[in-house]
Structures are given as C-alpha cells and as structure tokens.
C-alpha cells in the first residue's frame, strides 16, 4: 500500500541565463528509496540518483545540470527552451513508484524573480 506523498517545488519561474533548483521530497512513508530519476518535458532523462552508485548526469546535460541539493537537481545557464514540465520519479520498496511534477517557466525579463515553494501537486 502506497502511503507516501511527493512534495515538489510546484510551479516555478527563473531568469534566462540563471539557475534553478528542482526539488522533490517523499514524505509520509517508511519506504526505502532505491533510485530517483529526473526527466524533462519530452521525457528524456536528465539524471538518476541510485542509492548505491550515486549520481549519473546524462552526458548531454553534464555542463548544465548539477546534482543536489539532496535528491534534487540544479539546472544552470537556463534558456527559454528549458521552459516546461519536469518529473521526479522515486523508485522505492516496498511501496513502488512515486512521481512528482514541476513546471518551470524561464523568463526573459530581468525583473523575473525566482519563485519556489513546496507544494503537493
């Protein structure tokens, strides 16, 4: 029985050229996390964090994606093309799979404020 919930940074915005932290948090469960996958809007894999073997950043994103903090992911040197959905998938036992969604909007405006708050999608 899956009792946990995924909390995410929800809908966030950040400046073009800047950086942003994508964060998911699994709560309300004692399940053990074996692997966390991070995917972007076209469902291509950005990175995985395996509980035993650590972080693996997909080579194409190595210059712009940094692991952490925690099980989160930091996107750097943002472009307008980075706008869209991002997904964290928590593979756990004995519960199974949990999935969270974040929407990132990259703004041209110099007045764009990085806004992030934890919320349950």
């Amino acid at each position: 029985m899956m009792t946990g919930t995924i909390e995410t940074t929800g809908n966030i915005s950040a400046k073009k050229g800047g950086s942003v932290i994508l964060q998911c948090h699994l709560s309300s469960t004692m399940a053990q996390v074996t692997q966390v996958n991070w995917e972007q809007h076209d469902h291509s894999l950005l990175a995985i964090r395996n509980a035993e073997l650590g972080w693996h950043i997909y080579p194409a994103f190595k210059d712009r994606v940094a692991p952490g903090p925690g099980l989160g992911l930091t996107l750097q040197s943002l472009t307008m093309n980075d706008t869209g959905e991002y997904f964290c998938t928590y593979h756990t036992y004995p519960d199974g799979t949990y999935r969270g969604r974040i929407f990132l909007e990259v703004l041209e405006s110099s007045v764009a404020e990085h806004s992030a708050r934890f919320q349950i999608p």
Epitope: T34, N37, L45, I48, L53, G54
Partner: antibody, heavy 125, light 106 residues
Framework: QVQLVQSGAEVKKPGASVKVSCKAS????????IGWVRQAPGQGLEWMGW????????NYAQKLQGRVTMTTDTSTSTAYMELRSLRSDDTAVYYC??????????????????WGQGTMVTVSS | DIQMTQSPSSLSASVGDRVTITCRAS??????LNWYQQKPGKAPKLLIY???SLQSGVPSRFSGSGSGTDFTLTISSLQPEDFATYYC????????FGGGTKVEIK
C-alpha cells in the same frame, strides 16, 4: 556482439591478493554498471558488489568490506576486482556481469544480463 | 539483509511437464526480483527481470509472477535444454540470491 571476457585462472596462497579483469566489448562501457558474483565449488551464487563505470562509485557486500576493491579503466573498457587477504573459503569461480539496464534507460538498476565466462581462483597452501 | 528462500531445492521432471519454482523474500521487495538459469560449468543467464518481464531472447515458455514476498518462476512445457539450476535474485540493496533449484531429468 556484447561480451565480457575475463582473465585466466589463478592459484594463490592464503594471505595473498588476486586481481581479476573483465574486458567489455560491443557496447558503451560507461553506460552500464558492472557487478561481481562468486560461486564456491558446488555452491550457490554470492553477490560481491558492483561499480558504476560512469562515475566509479562502488557498493560492496558487507562481508567483503575492507578486503575487496572494484575499479574500472574506461580507456580500455575493463573492470577489475581485487580481493586481498585470501582465505581457503575464497576459492570460487568469480564472475563479472553487466547491469541489464543502462543508466539512461530510467529503469531501476538491478538485474545482470551479460556475464563473463568466469575466473577460477584457488586459494591453497 | 533480505533472505531469499527457494523451494524446492531440487526436483525431477520430464520433458513436457509444467514446472513451478518459488522464491520467498524475508520482507517485501515489491517487484525487485530476477530469475537466472545456470548450466554446469557455465555462467548464469538472465531469464526474468522485475518479477515478470521476459528477458530478450528467452523462450516464452518461461514466465515469472509475484510481488511483495512471494514469487514464482514457471516453465510451461519443460524442454531438454531446460534441465539446469535456477536462481532468484532480489535487487534491493544489498542484493542476495536464493539457494538455487536444480531441475533434473526424471
């Protein structure tokens, strides 16, 4: 084709060390983990640990901690397993095996689909 | 560590028989279970991963089922080349194998 070729049989004295190699070919070496499993004569399979060929991180079976070291050489697509302070009960066939899932498949890492032919290590005085 | 108990440890069967091997985990492992076949003097071969997914190139007479703590490998119609030892392996850290089931000719 995808294959793992291991080094030849070894005979060692108690207290010595052994280093077994496992050369990969036919796939992108850095996209898959490599695990090591051993099998004592007439016995079952025993998990030893594994290594990420991408970042070099390792995870070892607790009973072997401190005696085993797994490494990779990405320039030659070769994985190595060194076992130190050998005892008679380390006598076994040692297998390397490729993780069935690429790091980039999104699948949870865990099964092993391609295996080396095995390396017999005999520990005897 | 999670213990994996396979049963039976050995069985005798004839060509054409339906064979079932079970594997029980000491605690729930979701679907983190794989099955291997090993013939004497050879390396293990992956048959089933994630409890029920058939590995590419493996005949469809092999199937896997179960989740949580109880898992089954079924060979629907035993063939001469299927006489071997079968191992389950759980892939929850730290990985462990079952003790094996030897399938012999009756």
């Amino acid at each position: 084709q995808v294959q793992l070729v291991q080094s030849g049989a070894e005979v060692k004295k108690p207290g010595a060390s052994v280093k077994v190699s496992c050369k990969a070919s036919g796939y992108t070496f850095t996209s898959y983990p490599i695990g090591w499993v051993r099998q004592a004569p007439g016995q079952g399979l025993e998990w030893m640990g594994w290594i990420s060929s991408y970042n070099g991180n390792t995870n070892y079976a607790q009973k072997l901690q401190g005696r085993v070291t797994m490494t990779t050489d990405t320039s030659t697509s070769t994985a190595y397993m060194e076992l130190r302070s050998l005892r008679s009960d380390d006598t076994a066939v040692y297998y390397c095996a490729r993780g069935a899932s690429s790091f980039w498949s999104g699948d949870v890492l865990g099964a092993f689909d391609i295996w080396g032919q095995g390396t017999m290590v005999t520990v005897s005085s | 560590d999670i213990q994996m108990t396979q049963s039976p440890s050995s069985l005798s069967a004839s060509v054409g028989d339906r064979v079932t091997i079970t594997c029980r985990a000491s605690q729930s492992i979701s679907s983190y279970l794989n099955w291997y076949q090993q013939k004497p003097g050879k390396a293990p071969k992956l048959l089933i991963y994630a409890a029920s997914s058939l590995q590419s190139g493996v005949p469809s007479r092999f199937s896997g089922s179960g989740s949580g703590t109880d898992f089954t490998l079924t060979i629907s119609s035993l063939q001469p080349e299927d006489f071997a030892t079968y191992y389950c392996q759980q892939s929850v850290p730290p990985r462990t194998f079952g003790g094996g089931t030897k399938v012999e000719i009756k």
